[in-house]
């Protein structure tokens, strides 16, 4: 499934198999925090409509120094279009509000799930 | 606890349609796809079709596509399953399955089923 | 469709025994893989999801491994209530498929 029922993103939606690999990327994060993840590191909340992997990759990549969501964003940044870098914003960020990163990764799982199931059952 | 009750036994003439029911309760409807799942002593279990609560959306097994129907009902938490045009061979045990596709698998909770006997 | 081919269909062993299920998928299932445990009259319960994951309250002598093509359910001592009917299911693509089942009795 290269389409994500409805989902409009600029640049490529991920298959359902790379899409399922992100989401057991981001569940093994969540089952195996222990200590607060990133030390509690806070970083800009986003919208989750079209373009959320390029904003969700703008968001993490200014998190530095953390082993556990390395593989996540390595992972985003192969379902963005365009090279991110450090200190780049989107209009898709919530500037306002800041978040750690541990309720950032729970909001975008939940979202990824419904996408998952959405282009299941389409 | 997550719960899956299911309707009661059906005893239905051959030709004739009946709707099961599958109420959830335990945790967020929507959270969860749904599937339908019919058991015989010749087939064993065979994966009727899923559906999204949140969308409507489902998967059907190309077996079964014609036979079942499958909704939701949010405001209920409640899935249906239709099944038309019964002959002899949908005499069955028809199960709903729910559950995280990530965390359980798709068919981590099970309803207790129900029978279906098509008769004349 | 992906066949599920899981052997042996039945089984005696006694209690104490370890006991070994497998189950041959007709193509990689990438280990979404789950095993069930149906006693006479009753509603499947799942034991085992993703291949390796036991499901919270199920026996720790439950395991499940494997990988590609081919899954095991191991039992590591088998206990009186473990008699019934196993199965296995994948659910790496649609239509999802079961195993044939396997029937365990104790000698």
């Known amino acids: 499934l290269t389409c994500l029922g409805g989902f409009a993103s600029p640049g490529p939606v991920p298959p359902s198999t790379a899409l399922r690999e992100l989401i057991e990327e981001l569940v093994n994060i969540t089952q195996n925090q222990k200590a607060p993840l990133c030390n509690g590191s806070m970083v800009w909340s986003i919208n989750l409509t079209a373009g959320m992997y390029c904003a969700a990759l703008e968001s993490l990549i200014n998190v530095s120094g953390c082993s556990a969501i390395e593989k996540t964003q390595r992972m985003l940044s192969g379902f963005c279009p365009h090279k991110v870098s450090a200190g780049q914003f989107s209009s898709l960020h919530v500037r306002d509000t800041k978040i750690e990163v541990a309720q950032f990764v729970k909001d975008l799982l939940l979202h990824l799930k419904k996408l998952f199931r959405e282009g299941q059952f389409n | 606890q997550v719960q899956l009750q299911q309707s009661g036994a059906e005893l239905v003439r051959p030709g004739a349609s009946v709707t099961l029911s599958c109420k959830a309760s335990?945790?967020?409807?929507?959270?969860?796809?749904m599937h339908w799942v019919k058991q015989t002593p010749v087939h064993g279990l065979e994966w009727i079709g899923g559906i999204d609560p949140e969308t409507g959306g489902t998967a059907s097994n190309q077996k079964f596509k014609g036979k079942a129907i499958l909704t939701a009902d949010k405001s209920s938490s409640t899935a249906y399953m239709e099944l038309r045009s019964l002959t002899s061979e949908d005499s069955a045990v028809y199960y709903c399955?729910?559950?995280?596709?990530f965390g359980g698998g798709p068919f981590a909770y099970w309803g207790q089923g129900t029978l279906v006997t098509v008769s004349a | 469709d992906i066949k599920m081919t899981q052997s042996p269909s039945s089984m005696y062993a006694s209690l104490g025994e370890r006991v070994t299920i497998t189950c041959k998928a007709s193509q990689d299932i990438n280990s979404y893989l789950s095993w069930f445990q149906q006693k006479p009259g009753k509603s499947p319960k799942t034991l085992i999801y993703r291949a390796n994951r036991l499901v919270d309250g199920v026996p720790s002598r439950f395991s499940g491994s494997g990988s590609g093509q081919d899954y095991s359910l191991t039992i590591s001592s088998l206990d009186y209530e473990d008699m019934g009917i196993y199965y296995c299911l994948q659910y790496d693509e649609f239509p999802y498929t079961f195993g044939g089942g396997t029937k365990l009795e104790i000698k």
């Open positions: 399955t729910s559950g995280d596709y």
């Open positions: 335990g945790y967020t409807f929507t959270d969860y796809e």
